[in-house]
Amino acid sequence: APTSSSTKKTQLQLEHLLLDLQMILNGINNYKNPKLTRMLTFKFYMPKKATELKHLQCLEEELGPLEEVLNLAQSKNFHLRPRDLISNIRVIVLELKGSETTFMCEYADETATIVEFLNRWITFCQSIISTLT
C-alpha cells in the first residue's frame, strides 16, 4: 500500500508537471506568439483512457512532437529551452509512471491541436491530484 510520504511525493511531482504544462500552454497562447497558426497544424494524439498514472505513457510518447512544436515558438515565451523543458517533464513522467512496466498506450481516433492536448493533460493532473488530497 502507498505510504503517506510516497503519496505526498506523487502529489508534488504531479503539481510540478501541472505547472510545466500550464506554463507551456500560457506561452503558446501568448498573443505575441507569431507561430501559433503553424503550431495549431501539428497533430497530437490523445489517450482513449487517462485515469491512472500508467496512462502517462501516452503523454510520454507525445513529448517528442511537443518539443518540436515548442522549437517553433520564440524562446522568450518560456523560461527554459524546449529541450530542457521537455527533458524535465520526461524525468517527472518517468518517475510517476515508472519504467518497469511496459504499458502500451491506446489512442483515440480523433487527433487534437497542441492546445487541446495540453488542456487534456492539465485536466488529468488536476484529477489525479484531487484524488490524492
Epitope: F42, Q57, G64, P65, E68, N71, L72, S99, C105
Partner: antibody, heavy 123, light 107 residues
C-alpha cells in the same frame, strides 16, 4: 504519394565540397522536416541532420557541425545538403528522408526516403 | 549520445523459420524506436514504429516488442524476400542514432 528524388552520383577530390539535392513531390516541402542520413560502403546508417523548411531552422549531429549545411528552397520543394572539406571517409550513399507531425503517427518516423546519392571522394 | 546495440550481427535461418532480432538501448528511450529493412542497392524501408506499431503495407508476420530498454523485431515465418539487413533507430533525442544492423541471411 510523396516521392523524394535525389540528384545523381558525384565524384570529388579530397578538400572539395559537394551539394546534393532532394526534390519532394506529392506534397509541399513545408509539411516535412527534411533529414539527411548517410551510409558508407558496407557500413551502417548515420544521421547527419535536418531542416525545417518552413523557418530554415536546422539541427546537426556533432560529428558534422562546421562541415555540413542543410538548406531548403520552398519555391521548388527541394532540400539540399552541402558537405565541405571532403575526405575519403565521406565516401558514402547519402539519403534524404522525412518526418512530419501534420499527418499520421507513422509519418513521424522516417517513412519516405530518396533513392540515395553516391558520393565518392578520391584523389 | 544514445547507443543502440543490435544482436546478432548475422542471423542464418531458412524460409519458414522464426527470426528474432534484438536491439538494446544504452538508456531509457520509452517507445521511441523504429525498425527498418534494407536490401542491397535500396533505401531503408520502415517496418515498425513506436516500438510495436506495424507500418502501412508491411506484412503481419513482422512484429515489434519492448521490455524496458530491450527491443525485439520478430518475423514469425520467414519468406524469401525477408532476407536483408535490419536496423533499429531511436528518436528519443538528437542525434538520432541507428543500431549497427543485423544481417539476416539464408541458411
Amino acid at each position: 504519394q510523396v516521392q523524394l528524388v535525389q540528384s545523381g552520383a558525384e565524384v570529388k577530390k579530397p578538400g572539395a565540397t559537394v551539394k546534393i539535392s532532394c526534390k519532394v513531390s506529392g506534397d509541399t516541402i513545408t509539411a516535412y522536416y527534411m533529414h539527411w542520413v548517410r551510409q558508407a560502403p558496407g557500413q551502417g546508417l548515420e544521421w547527419i541532420g535536418r531542416i525545417d523548411p518552413d523557418d530554415d531552422s536546422t539541427k546537426y549531429a556533432e560529428n558534422f557541425k562546421g562541415r555540413v549545411t542543410i538548406t531548403a528552397d520552398t519555391s521548388t520543394d527541394t532540400a539540399y545538403m552541402e558537405l565541405s572539406s571532403l575526405r575519403s571517409e565521406d565516401t558514402a550513399v547519402y539519403y534524404c528522408t522525412t518526418i512530419t507531425f501534420l499527418y499520421s503517427r507513422e509519418l513521424r518516423w522516417f517513412a519516405y526516403w530518396g533513392q540515395g546519392t553516391l558520393v565518392t571522394v578520391s584523389s | 549520445d544514445i547507443v543502440l546495440t543490435q544482436s546478432p550481427a548475422t542471423l542464418s535461418l531458412s524460409p519458414g523459420e522464426r527470426a528474432t532480432l534484438s536491439c538494446q538501448a544504452s538508456q531509457y528511450i520509452s517507445n521511441y524506436l523504429s525498425w527498418y529493412q534494407q536490401k542491397p542497392g535500396q533505401a531503408p524501408r520502415l517496418l515498425i514504429y513506436s516500438a510495436t506499431s506495424l507500418a502501412s503495407g508491411i506484412p503481419a508476420r513482422f512484429s515489434g516488442s519492448r521490455s524496458g530498454t530491450d527491443f525485439t523485431l520478430t518475423i514469425s515465418s520467414l519468406e524469401p524476400e525477408d532476407f536483408a539487413v535490419y536496423y533499429c533507430l531511436q528518436h528519443y533525442s538528437t542525434p538520432y542514432t541507428f543500431g549497427q544492423g543485423t544481417k539476416l541471411e539464408i541458411k
